[in-house]
């Protein structure tokens, strides 16, 4: 694949990841009622974030915002955070790596400044989807415990009034937003990894170049017995190299100046 | 304002399936479930189950579940009941109801009274 | 199914007195999600079909008279007229609003004296 195919590729999957991340952040539905017993409730609960919502069979939804910030789990507040992180490095990134791609020119941005910045948005994306990642399953073990926590309570010491009266407990398993958010996650960290994979195909070749400043002679050069090649580039392969005023390019280099099929 | 209009009696043989209507408006009528309730003389309330006008999704009273069946015609904003194989014991005022909060039924028809004889 | 048990199942006051009437349920109508307890009452007269009183086991609805009062939480429920008017004869019916079957009580008859 090519160094452009995989920048543009690793920006747009990071993008898509990046969009779902901020998506799971603000869905409702991180935890879910469990309907297992009862597949069909006529209150249907479910919590996310930052607001807990009530859906009647009646078709009326009522949701309350979590007013208060001390009366918060920790964990909650965690996972809070780590999402918010994961966004915030994600437009970081975004930005940065819109700058880095190579289709795009900016004054006389070289292609060593574009490796950096390749390279910065995709630590950038890695550490988001990474983010994103822990913060999600931070919350999902968060709901196992819960549940298994709920579920021995409904089998012990049922209900009061010597046991006439159940008391209806309320289970939560994963929500949409769990799902989106793994997913999300996962293809901004693949997006960061393409980007530092491109990355390594926008830096130019130093060694291959810089070690040697004379020009071998042409006598030298027939006395050598076999191997040592004038650039000394130690063994690497130069083969799709090609010299222009004494610095280095690769032949997708060669196609850096826009034309109109750059732009898509 | 809101109404939901049902014949005022019908009388139907025994065996004989009979289709009770409910005829909505003053309302969106596919944004509110229609539920119907059976109440025999000088007795209580019966939910027997609910359907949803938009994609006519139903739930039912297992008690009634191969008794009624719950159907909507939604150009003419129109709820039906059909109940199968109709014996005395099916001779009640079937209500039907809009659903509100709370699961709540906050408009009522008139009621049919359904006579089942021969 | 959750059983709903009305106590008394009827009761005669004169007009101008406080009454209160008891439902109970065999399982708890509080949903945790929202703090609301779905249990909702119905008032019927005779000959016609019951209306709405009180949903959420104590919100009013609309055009109901504030002498009405519904309270209570979990599976104890309160429905007070506090103070009877002739009008208010009618058979009382609370119902199960938390989880199908949809169940009612079987009644508290109200007369007046």
């Known amino acids: 694949m090519s160094v452009t195919a995989c920048q543009g590729l690793g920006f747009v999957v990071s993008l898509i990841g990046f969009a779902g991340i901020i998506a799971a952040t603000c869905m409702d539905q991180w935890s879910t009622q469990d309907l297992y017993n009862n597949p069909v409730t006529a209150v249907f609960n479910y919590q996310g974030l930052w607001r807990s919502c009530v859906r009647e069979s009646s078709g009326f939804t009522e949701c309350r915002g979590y007013f208060t910030l001390l009366g918060l789990p920790a964990m909650l507040q965690a996972v809070r955070a780590l999402m918010i992180v994961g966004i915030v490095l994600g437009v970081i990134g975004i930005l940065v790596s819109i700058f880095a791609l190579k289709c795009i020119r900016i004054g006389s941005m070289d292609d060593s400044a574009k490796a950096k910045m390749t390279l910065t948005s995709g630590i950038l994306f890695i550490i988001s989807g990474i983010s994103a990642i822990i913060g999600v399953s931070v919350f999902a073990n968060m709901l196992v415990t819960n549940f298994w926590m709920s579920t021995a309570n409904m089998y012990s010491g049922m209900g009061g009034m010597g046991g006439m009266v159940q008391t209806v407990q309320t289970r939560y398993t994963f929500g949409a937003a769990l799902f989106v958010g793994w997913v999300a996650g996962g293809l901004t960290l693949i997006g960061g990894v393409m980007m530092c994979i491109a990355c390594r195909g926008l830096t130019p070749d130093d060694s291959n170049f810089k070690a040697v400043s004379y020009h071998a002679s042409g006598q030298n050069v027939a006395y050598r017995p076999g191997g040592f090649k004038a650039s000394t580039g130690f063994g690497s392969n130069t083969r799709n190299k090609k010299i222009y005023d004494g610095g280095a390019r690769t032949e997708d280099d060669e196609q850096s100046h826009p034309t109109k099929y750059d732009y898509v | 304002q809101v109404q939901l209009q049902q014949p005022g009696a019908e009388l139907v043989r025994p065996g004989a399936s009979v289709k009770l209507s409910c005829k909505a408006s003053?309302?969106?009528?596919?944004?509110?479930?229609i539920n119907w309730v059976k109440q025999r003389p000088g007795q209580g309330l019966e939910w027997i189950g609910n359907i949803y006008p938009s994609d006519s999704y139903t739930n039912y009273n297992q008690k009634f579940k191969d008794k009624a069946t719950l159907t909507v015609d939604k150009s003419s904003s129109t709820a039906y009941m059909q109940l199968s194989s109709p014996t005395s014991e099916d001779s009640a005022v079937y209500y039907c109801?809009?659903?509100?909060?709370?699961?709540?039924?906050?408009?009522w028809g008139q009621g049919t009274t359904l006579t089942v004889s021969s | 199914d959750i059983v709903m048990t009305q106590s008394p199942s009827s009761l005669t006051v004169t007009a101008g007195e406080k009454v209160t009437m008891s439902c109970k349920s065999s399982q708890s109508l509080l949903n945790s999600g929202n703090q609301k307890n779905y249990l909702t009452w119905y008032q019927q007269k005779p000959g016609q079909p019951p209306k709405l009183l009180i949903y959420?086991?104590?919100t009013r609805e609309s055009g109901v008279p504030d002498r009405f009062t519904g309270s209570g939480s979990g599976t104890d429920f309160t429905l007070t007229i506090s103070s009877v008017q002739a009008e208010d004869l009618a058979v009382y019916y609370c119902q199960n609003d938390y989880s199908y079957p949809f169940t009612f009580g079987s009644g508290t008859k109200l007369e007046i004296k």
């Open positions: 959420w086991a104590s």
């Open positions: 109801t809009r659903s509100w909060r709370g699961n709540s039924f906050d408009y």
């Open positions: 003053g309302y969106t009528f596919t944004s509110y479930w």
